[in-house]
């Protein structure tokens, strides 16, 4: 997978008036990395590993960049003409990637009230607008403003692309991201399925990087894909990932089944626990925690694009 840096900024307006402040998160390699603390008006690392990336350096540069980006986005929202009464949001997601072959990609996406209306490839400067008439109107609005704004010239987009990549390279240079491996905790549970059957679920949690093999084996041989159910590999909010795999087996045949896990060159096998069948949920309920986002987002059900 490529290394990536993703900026996620949101600004709000109420009855056509742009609210002060902004929400910002930065993800490094898909993990929550920085968050803008609106009380302290500073960029804050998300967890110990994020702190380790910069070591003893300060987060002043990140604070300055996020503050500048937030200000730009508030100005952009102010120029969106069709703001009706009530609450509205403008979200900007900017991503840059460095691939294994050292090639790079950069893009920028704008969402209004959770709906994508404008994307730009920051390398080719090519804009893309969804088909809907609302998106077309919004996109024209924003593009006109960006053209008017002397800062938003070709040079500006090249700079955005270059800055993002420069920051990503700076973070990778610390080596923390590259050499970081956290082995998974693996846990096998069983639950009642139907008459004579049980569902066995194998969960792997708190692992990094995200690449993992998790599969059920019968007599040491992997079960076919169609007899297993997999969960997505999802961030767990601690800079690590979680996933699960489940299958249905005949009661009494538990001894034949093991969960096989392979991660970062290490592997393990985990038997089905014997004994009383526990009535457990066989699938995780995945809650997306948004790391202290403003309550107004929850209250107004504004979509947050991950």
């Amino acid at each position: 997978e490529p290394h990536s840096l993703r900026y996620n900024l949101t600004v709000l307006s109420w009855d056509g008036s742009v609210q002060s402040g902004f929400l910002a998160e930065v993800h490094l390699d898909g993990q929550p990395f920085l968050r803008y603390d609106r009380q302290k008006c500073r960029a804050k690392p998300q967890g110990q590993w994020a702190e380790d990336v910069l070591g003893n350096k300060t987060w002043d540069r990140e604070t300055r960049d996020l503050t500048g980006n937030g200000k730009d986005l508030r100005m952009t929202l102010a120029h969106i003409k069709d703001q009706k009464e009530g609450l509205h949001s403008l979200q900007e997601i900017r991503v840059c990637e460095i691939h294994e072959d050292n090639s790079t990609r950069s893009s920028q996406h704008f969402y209004y009230d959770g709906e994508l209306f404008l994307s730009q490839n920051l390398e080719t400067e090519e804009w893309t607008v969804p088909q809907s008439s609302r998106a077309q109107t919004l996109a024209m609005n924003v593009r006109n403003f960006l053209k008017e704004d002397a800062m938003k010239t070709k040079t500006h987009y090249h700079a955005m692309h270059a800055d993002c990549l420069q920051e990503l390279r700076r973070y990778l240079e610390s080596g923390v991201v590259l050499r970081r491996t956290v082995p998974p905790m693996v846990n096998v549970t069983r639950s009642e399925a139907s008459e004579g059957n049980i569902t066995v679920t194998c969960r792997a949690s708190s692992f990094y990087p995200r690449n993992i093999i998790l599969t059920w084996r019968q007599d040491g041989v992997s079960l076919s894909h169609d007899t297993q159910q997999w969960g997505d590999v999802l961030p767990d909010g601690n800079g690590t990932y979680q996933t699960w795999v489940a299958t249905r087996i005949c009661r009494g045949e538990e001894q034949r089944f093991t969960c096989y896990m392979e991660h970062s060159g290490n592997h393990s096998t985990h038997p089905v626990p014997s004994g009383k069948v526990l009535v457990l949920q066989s699938h995780w309920q995945h809650h997306h925690h948004h790391h202290g986002l403003n309550d107004i987002f929850e209250a107004q059900k504004i979509e947050w694009h991950e």
């Epitope: 084996r217 040491g220 041989v221 034949r256 093991t258 096998t269």
Partner: antibody, heavy 118, light 107 residues
Amino acid sequence: QVQLQQSGPELVKPGASVKVSCKASGYAFTKYNIYWVKQSHGKSLEWIGYIDPYNGGTVYNQKFKGKATLTVDKSSSTAYMHLNSLTSEDSAVYYCATTDGYSLFTYWGQGTLVTVSA
Amino acid sequence: DIQMTQTTSSLSASLGDRVTITCSAGQGINNYLNWYQQKPDGTVKLLIFYTSSLQSGVPSRFSGSGSGADYSLTISNLEPEDIATYYCQQYSKLPLTFGAGTKLELK
């Protein structure tokens, strides 16, 4: 490539015990089960049991419970089958086998002849 | 235990022949069936797994088919190195069980 090298032939007395070894090479030993199979002279194959080298977990054919004990030594990538209270019925060629994770008994050892005779 | 029956204990064929070896299980085994070849020197090799999947490195003249309780192994064009004993094996239920074997000889 995957290889399973078994110990040499054994001539043992009735009532005694024997330990057959199976040294694995060419793959990560703890990744895949080791299976044991018996073939009496001129007869078919019988599955004895298997062991998971990662955690030592075993599953036996009921018929061989109490007769065979499966163990592993991870440090030398070697699996062992201990046969006790031997009788002439236990005279046979014993095979170890492993898997590639997709099919049973994918790779086989060359077999170990155990002869029980007074 | 699931009984695996190979009705033909020995079979004579000529080089180039198409040979079919059959195997039936005491009950349905959901295609959980493998085929093995044992050479006269005792060497054992997996040929087919899960009824019809050809093991890597096995010549394509070998094929497997079947469902329910009845299965077969076919050698489309018999070669000298195919002279061996062939065993079917089920892994639907424990204990894992093998057929009695079919010894293939040259006419």
